[in-house]
């Protein structure tokens, strides 16, 4: 039976009809009392006092309502949940993930996990209603957990008309290769000992380091991974592992040449709730590699939205060459990652200036052959974008990737809903399209426009009458991603390039074929 529920937009927790709850008001000491009425949360401020007993984990501040028994935790940065039990910065799980308390919420199939408090799970052996739920990491959230000591974190997903458990695609902290680091590498305990410039690291117990804070003599040295070795470490929460080096007889430090363990192409997909012409409104967490590129124009004040882009490494964005025909100076460009609404700043967005951009030398502005460009983000260190649930790289395809004809893939962007619309979309959209066979991706299928071997076609193959809402890219989506699932990860197959109109039956969109440019990409991204 259909149940009316409320979703608290601030915390993403769900509540049944007439259920009440407390929530802290961000960036203030106020607390609100909310209750679920016909699918809408109604909230007002209530007086609170300090809790009579500690109930919050991880340094959370407990407050309880003055006139009834509920309590609320004000969580320190990096923690969330009713009792601050959720570690929002955990990027991977250790061992079997029994102690994993991160926010990954996507199953291996790509399905979105179900909230553990959902009434649909009430009869399941593991749900947020269990008396020991908090101890097991279960609660009013849909994050992957391993409450039954299985081999890795899992969750319940709704498929084939029922709820069943499925393993999650949460990254493991040591995917058989501990000589790479996750997140900022604070937990890195590998044996790399060279810096990015090729210099050898000094041992952490070297006499030269006397007076430095981070040495083998530090009281927390063991916990920080420092000792009688010269392996790269990140004891101070810097951007990535580093070490002390001697450069021209001068003591300094440098970031290390340790590869980051790839979490490319992993995402926390949520089923879009709203259909819109040409596709579906989406959240950035479902497409965390999507970038928005803005440009300052010489003639008009302010910035205007230019094109989409694709995050392929911490400091590099792929886009379409035709977006840069105006030859903007790099400092007139801005790249924004982690944004759901095109012109509304996101809470976790990251904004960058552009160091330089490289347009393919053989880009043809008549045919759009070689429609590819690379933008290097500006940063003070060797890292630019910081990985989070809303910012993550897409995987580049292997050179020999050949997906079957009609494989279902997806594209995303902030482009127009339809060709004749005067406006770009206010919110990120996604569209589901299928890869056309090369025999259906020719000039004769595209009004005699030139189609080269550097292009591929994809479109919505559903049969539809004149009112059908066929998915497609449109103006403003250019430079954005066409991604397909490969080996459990979303892999970049195409760059949105051109098309005839938008969403027309039997007229595919045309994309830059990324496998043809892997060497070009690698070559231009060299340090």
């Amino acid at each position: 039976s259909y149940q009316v529920i409320c979703r608290d937009e601030k915390t993403q927790m769900i509540y049944q009809q007439h259920q009440s709850w407390l929530r802290p008001v961000l960036r203030s000491n106020r607390v609100e009392y909310c209750w679920c009425n016909s699918g809408r949360a109604q909230c007002h401020s209530v007086p609170v006092k300090s809790c009579s007993e500690p109930r919050c984990f991880n340094g959370g501040t407990c407050q309880q309502a003055l006139y009834f028994s509920d309590f609320v935790c004000q969580c320190p940065e990096g923690f969330a949940g009713k009792c601050c039990e959720i570690d929002t910065r955990a990027t991977c799980y250790e061992d079997q993930g029994i102690s994993y308390r991160g926010t990954w919420s996507t199953a291996e199939s790509g399905a979105e996990c179900t909230n553990w408090n959902s009434s649909a799970l009430a009869q399941k052996p593991y749900s947020g209603r269990r008396p020991d739920a908090i101890r097991l990491g279960l609660g009013n959230h849909n994050y992957c957990r391993n409450p039954d000591r299985d081999s890795k974190p899992w969750c319940y997903v709704f498929k084939a008309g029922k709820y069943s458990s499925e393993f999650c695609s949460t990254p493991a902290c040591s995917e058989g290769n501990s000589d790479c680091y996750f997140g900022n590498g604070s937990a890195y305990r590998g044996t790399h000992s060279l810096t990015e410039s090729g210099a050898s690291c000094l041992p952490w117990n070297s006499m030269i380091l006397i007076g430095k804070v981070y040495t083998a003599q530090n009281p927390s040295a063991q916990a920080l991974g420092l000792g009688k070795h010269n392996y790269c470490r990140n004891p101070d929460g810097d951007a990535k592992p580093w070490c002390h080096v001697l450069k021209n007889r001068r003591l300094t430090w440098e970031y290390c040449d340790v590869p980051s363990c790839s979490t490319c192409g992993l995402r926390q997909y949520s089923q879009p709730q709203f259909r819109i012409k040409g596709g579906l409104f989406a959240d950035i967490a479902s497409h965390p590699w999507q970038a928005a590129i803005f440009a300052k124009h010489r003639r008009s004040p302010g910035e205007r939205f230019l094109c989409g882009g694709i995050l392929i490494s911490s400091c590099w964005i792929l886009s379409a060459a035709h977006c840069f025909q105006e030859r903007f100076p790099p400092h007139h460009l801005t790249v924004i990652l982690g944004r759901t609404y095109r012109v509304v700043p996101g809470e976790e967005e990251q904004k960058f200036e552009v160091e330089k951009y490289i347009v393919h030398k053989e880009f043809d502005d008549d045919t759009y052959d070689n429609d590819i460009a690379l933008l290097q983000l500006k940063s003070d260190s060797s890292r630019c974008a910081q990985e989070s649930s809303v910012v993550r790289t897409v995987c580049l395809p292997p050179a020999d990737l050949q997906l079957p004809d009609w494989t279902e893939c997806e594209l995303s962007g902030y482009g127009k809903h339809e060709a004749l619309s005067p406006f770009y979309s206010e919110r990120l959209k996604e569209a589901h399209v299928r890869l056309y066979p090369s025999s259906r991706c020719t000039s004769q299928h595209l009004l005699n426009r030139t189609v080269t071997d550097n292009m591929l076609c994809a479109g919505d193959t559903r049969s539809g009458g004149p009112q059908a809402n066929l998915h497609d890219a449109c103006q403003g989506d250019s430079g954005g991603p066409l991604v397909c699932l490969n080996d459990g990860r979303m892999t970049l197959v195409g760059i949105i390039s051109w098309g005839l109109g938008c969403g027309q039956k039997d007229v595919p969109g045309v994309y830059t074929k990324v496998t043809n440019y892997l060497d070009w990409i690698r070559d231009n991204m060299r340090p």
Partner: antibody, heavy 114, light 112 residues
């Protein structure tokens, strides 16, 4: 520290093929280049492979005769040269490229002789 | 293809004296990403080549500071401020800016 260890010397007949391997340890995400050197001659760049995606670039001179592959699970790159002739007698080196070819294998001598 | 021309072909040196090797490219070797991938390698007798200088003027790890590189566009120079006996071997310049990548013909440095 990246270390590259190459397979042993080979003797081949003209027209045959040779496959040289290069096992990498350390950071194996960089291009692997193949460079050859005939006795008493200079260094000649043959091409490169990206161990991650497997994309390749071959120098025109070797196009059609050389194939560079990799097996990521064992961190090994391979260079196969076919239709061998006597002038292919040389030491073949693999070299890992990040900002330059900072790490080199010990070389594999391939002798082509009837 | 970019042709790299080195001079001299052979360089007899006296230990303690300076030495200089020139390398000229047939066209500019500034890469489209703005970098100039001009490297110098030394191949000592019976050994694999080793990196000395990368991107024109950056000394590789462990390379003594008597080695320095300079130049731009098409003209590049490797200097050894005071040659030591262990510096003998063949020096190669190399461009990695335009494919196919190419080496210079080499300069043999030997003690007088």
């Amino acid at each position: 520290q990246v270390q590259l260890v190459q397979s042993g010397a080979e003797v081949k007949k003209p027209g045959a093929s040779v496959k040289v391997s290069c096992k990498a340890s350390g950071n194996t995400s960089y291009w692997i280049n193949w460079v050859r050197q005939a006795t008493g001659q200079g260094l000649e760049w043959m091409g490169r492979i990206d161990p991650g995606g497997g994309s390749t670039y071959y120098a025109q001179k070797f196009q059609g005769r050389v194939t560079m592959t990799r097996n990521t699970s064992i961190s090994t790159a391979y260079m196969e040269l076919s239709s061998l002739r006597s002038e292919d007698t040389a030491v073949y080196y693999c070299a890992s490229y990040y900002y330059a070819m900072a790490y080199w294998g010990q070389g594999t001598l391939v002798t082509v002789s009837s | 293809d970019v042709v790299m021309t080195q001079s001299p072909l052979s360089l007899p040196v006296t230990p303690g004296e300076p030495a200089s090797i020139s390398c000229r490219s047939s066209q500019s070797i500034v890469h489209s990403n703005g970098n100039t991938y001009l490297d110098w390698y030394l191949q000592k007798p019976g050994q694999s080549p080793q990196l000395l200088i990368y991107k024109v003027s950056n000394r590789a790890s462990g390379v003594p500071d008597r080695f320095s590189g300079s130049g731009s566009g098409t003209d590049f120079t490797l200097k050894i401020s005071r040659v030591e006996a262990e510096d003998v071997g063949v020096y190669y310049c190399f461009q990695g800016s335009h494919v196919p990548w190419t080496f210079g013909g080499g300069t043999k440095v030997e003690i007088k």
